[in-house]
């Protein structure tokens, strides 16, 4: 008895496709190794038709794949277009040859079902509606005219010219003649379900002078359309429902035993376990629309389905989509914290994923926003400017190359909790859904600016110091000035080491910045932060103003523009070998050319990109001097 | 409310035929793998066969190879009833046959959503 399984007999017809799903046990070999499928002939060979491995037979070309479903100990072999060439013995099978672990399958495609030659064949999908054309001699103009569905005896009458209508197509069933032809009668059937499929005869007159016409309604549920989706990925669903929906609500919902259950409508409504990584998009005015989900999880593997009704809701005999989505827990994005926590006045480091292979690809931050139909304004991106309401307190820091980019966003409130959709213009798969937790700080913050009330005088020398804890020695500490374009690091070089010391003073670890001489262009937006290498951890902020020599010094800072940071992140690492540094930067950057604001993230990455050249974040033209001091005592 | 009400069983002699029925009202047939199940008295619940529809010309008919060669699984979807033909039958076939609706999900036999009384099949020799 063969460990594999699957449907030992497929029985279909021309033109349609099949899904073969065969089980294997649930072993690590059996996971990695080869899977097929073959066709045996009548010498007992079996000859690979596909296999895992990346073959596809010339016979099969463009119209059959084979996936495995390593988390679920099966592999599925799609083939479409069936002819009855197709029909014969297969094996689908596991190893390195066609004589390992197989099943046998046998698939018959037989031709569409022959019907009297006077028969009018029409096919139509669900939710559909049809009109059905019934022409008859003019002697039987006056006559009563017909439509009825045969049954295993009878014709059971639907609808006729006096207004008899059969129970189950009220509202639904229309007898009418078009201007003055009086040789043709037509039956519009409209909400067509499964029941509705079958043999009709259409009639004028009665006797064996009366017209017949025989009729062959199929009623198609439509075929799913396989999605094979990485674990934390994005999946986009694409419906198009027609023009005659176009005003009706619409709706995303997910197969359940006997119902299907609503993840998202146009009305509103949205399943909570999707809060946060889903958008609906209306396209146009046809009737189209797109469901985005993010951050793709196990359990979202199923049957999907779309729709349009007026109560959001599915409904029987309305059109429908529909969708298998796999869920691949091999993925190639990389398991990233899905929620990250801080405090209020402290700061967050979000790494963002993206694909490698996309360094060069716009990257954006934008937070998800639940009412109406779900929508993700962006926020700070590689080419798009910070909001305003974010001014001084987010930035995106690209790391080309290392398949992260880090955005930071610091004097955090409460406010700023919620989720937040990390995306590129690249690869779309690749959006990812992070959940901002923000708890009320209890403790004193890590990183600390003095002074606090920053006023620079115009001309003259002004410092400000960051004070760190001991926890923070082994990291790398910066100043950057933020602008809306980023928050450009203060260039720095190391002056001089000081020898090893094993004792750490936690009130006097600082580094300092030294505008030497103050310009306005110096006004603006500090921060100080620690970073390891490409890895951001906590900054603070703070607003330095700039004031002629001849005005006082006293300024109003911004609203919570000097706010205490608070731990974010938590590091654990004290580094006990030190260095005296004295580095002297110089900041330099280039000019940026205007760039369009991102205003929204639909469901098209492309619609994403923003013109303008890429260059150094924002700063000053002019050659000024900026000390960073390390003070260890 | 969904309802699988089996019908066709009774008592046959070996190497006998019975065609046993399964009326599904109230369940959106089309959309569930339909399979029938068997119980002898102080065995476990046994796979038979199942058959998956795909809504247009296509049926996957899978059977237990205790029964393969022996029995034909059917459906018509326009009546929301299955079929299992049993030919060729022996008395180890003798156990109360259970009518199941599934989900069509990939780990289908992991467990069916809707299951009839049963119908008892009686073989004797």
């Known amino acids: 008895k063969s460990p594999i399984f699957g449907p030992q007999e497929v029985s279909s017809i021309e033109g349609d496709s099949v899904s073969i799903t065969c089980y294997y046990p649930d072993t690590s070999v059996n996971r990695h190794t080869r899977k097929y499928w073959c066709r045996q002939g009548a010498s007992g060979m079996c000859t690979t038709l596909i296999s895992s491995n990346g073959y596809l037979s010339k016979e099969y070309s463009g119209r059959a794949n084979l996936i495995n479903f390593p988390e679920n100990n099966t592999f599925v072999i799609n083939i479409e277009q069936l002819t009855q060439d197709d029909t014969g013995s297969y094996k689908c099978g596991l190893g390195t040859s066609n004589r390992g672990l197989s099943f046998d399958v046998s698939l018959e495609v037989s031709q569409v079902p022959e019907l009297p030659s006077d028969t009018h064949v029409y096919t139509k999908d669900i939710g559909r509606n049809v009109t059905i054309e019934c022409p008859f001699k003019r002697e039987n103009a006056p006559s009563k005219k017909s439509l009825c569905k045969k049954t295993n005896q009878s014709c059971e009458l639907v609808i006729d010219s006096t207004e008899k209508v059969n129970p189950s197509y009220i509202g639904r069933a229309k007898l009418f003649m078009k201007g003055t032809d009086l040789t043709v009668f037509y039956v519009n059937i409209s909400h067509l379900t499964h029941n509705d499929a079958g043999l009709y005869i259409c009639q004028a007159g009665e006797g064996p002078s009366a017209d017949k016409k025989n009729v062959d309604l199929q009623v198609l549920a439509p075929e799913p359309e396989l999605l094979y989706k990485d674990l934390r990925s994005s999946v986009t669903f694409e419906c198009d429902l027609g023009r005659e929906v176009a005003n009706e609500a619409k709706y995303l919902c997910r197969m359940n035993k006997e119902t299907c259950d609503v993840i998202i409508n146009t009305l509103g409504k949205r399943d909570p376990d999707f809060e946060g990584r889903i958008l609906i998009t209306p396209k146009d005015d046809n009737g189209r629309f797109s469901v985005l989900i993010t951050g793709l999880r196990k359990e979202d593997a199923g049957h999907y389905q779309c729709g349009a009704h007026s109560s959001g809701l599915p409904q029987e005999g309305w059109p429908i989509q529909t969708w298998q989505l796999f869920v691949n827990e091999e993925s190639t994005i990389p398991n990233r914290r899905s929620v990250v926590k801080g405090v209020t006045g402290g700061s967050v480091a979000i790494a963002c994923p993206y694909n490698p292979k996309e360094s060069s690809s716009l990257k954006y931050w934008c937070r998800w926003e639940g009412d109406g139909n779900g929508h993700c304004p962006v926020l700070v991106g590689t080419q798009a400017q910070v909001q305003e309401e974010y001014e001084g307190r987010l930035a995106l820091f690209d790391q080309p190359g290392n398949g992260t980019y880090t955005v930071i966003l610091n004097q955090l409130t409460t406010e700023d909790a919620g989720f937040y959709w990390c995306l590129t213009n690249g690869d779309s798969r690749w959006r990812t859904t992070i959940e901002l937790q923000v708890a009320e700080a209890t403790r004193e913050p890590n990183l600390e600016v003095t002074p606090q009330n920053a006023t620079a005088v115009l001309g003259e020398t002004f410092t400000v110091s960051c004070h760190y804890p001991c926890k923070f020695y082994s990291q790398e500490k910066y100043w950057c000035k933020w602008s809306n374009k980023g928050c450009h690091i203060l260039p720095s070089h190391d002056e001089g080491a000081r020898q090893s010391s094993v004792s750490c003073d936690q009130s006097s670890q600082l580094v300092s910045m030294t505008l030497n001489p103050v310009s306005k262009e110096d006004e603006g937006w500090y921060w100080c932060g620690v970073k390891q290498g490409q890895t951001y951890g906590e900054t603070t902020a703070i607003y330095i103003a700039v004031e002629e020599r001849t005005r006082g010094s006293s300024h109003v800072n911004p609203t919570d523009a000097n706010a205490r940071a608070k731990v974010a992140l938590e590091e654990e690492v004290v580094d006990s070998s030190i260095s005296e540094k004295e580095n002297k930067a110089i900041p330099n950057p280039g000019p940026f050319a205007n760039e369009r604001e991102i205003q929204n993230v639909g469901d098209q990455a492309q619609e994403n990109r923003a013109s303008g050249d890429a260059g150094s974040a924002d700063g000053q033209s002019r050659s000024s001097s900026s000390k960073h001091h390390h003070h260890h005592h | 409310q969904v309802q699988l009400v089996e019908s066709g069983g009774g008592l046959v002699q070996a190497g006998g035929s019975l065609k046993l029925a399964c009326a599904a009202p109230?369940?959106?047939?089309?959309?569930?793998?339909m399979g029938w199940f068997r119980q002898a008295p102080g065995q476990e619940r046994e796979f038979v066969a199942a058959?998956?529809?795909?809504?247009?010309?296509?049926?996957?008919?899978y059977y237990a190879d205790s029964v393969k060669g022996r029995s034909t699984i059917s459906r018509d979807n326009a009546k929301n009833t299955m079929y299992l033909q049993m030919n060729s039958l022996k008395p180890e076939d003798t156990a109360v046959y259970y009518c199941?609706?599934?989900?069509?999900?990939?780990?289908?036999?992991?467990?069916?959503?809707?299951w009839g009384q049963g119908t008892q099949v009686t073989v004797s020799s």
């Open positions: 199941a609706a599934g989900s069509i999900d990939l780990n289908w036999y992991g467990g069916m959503d809707y």
């Open positions: 109230g369940l959106t047939f089309s959309s569930y793998r």
């Open positions: 058959i998956d529809w795909n809504g247009r010309g296509t049926y996957y008919r």
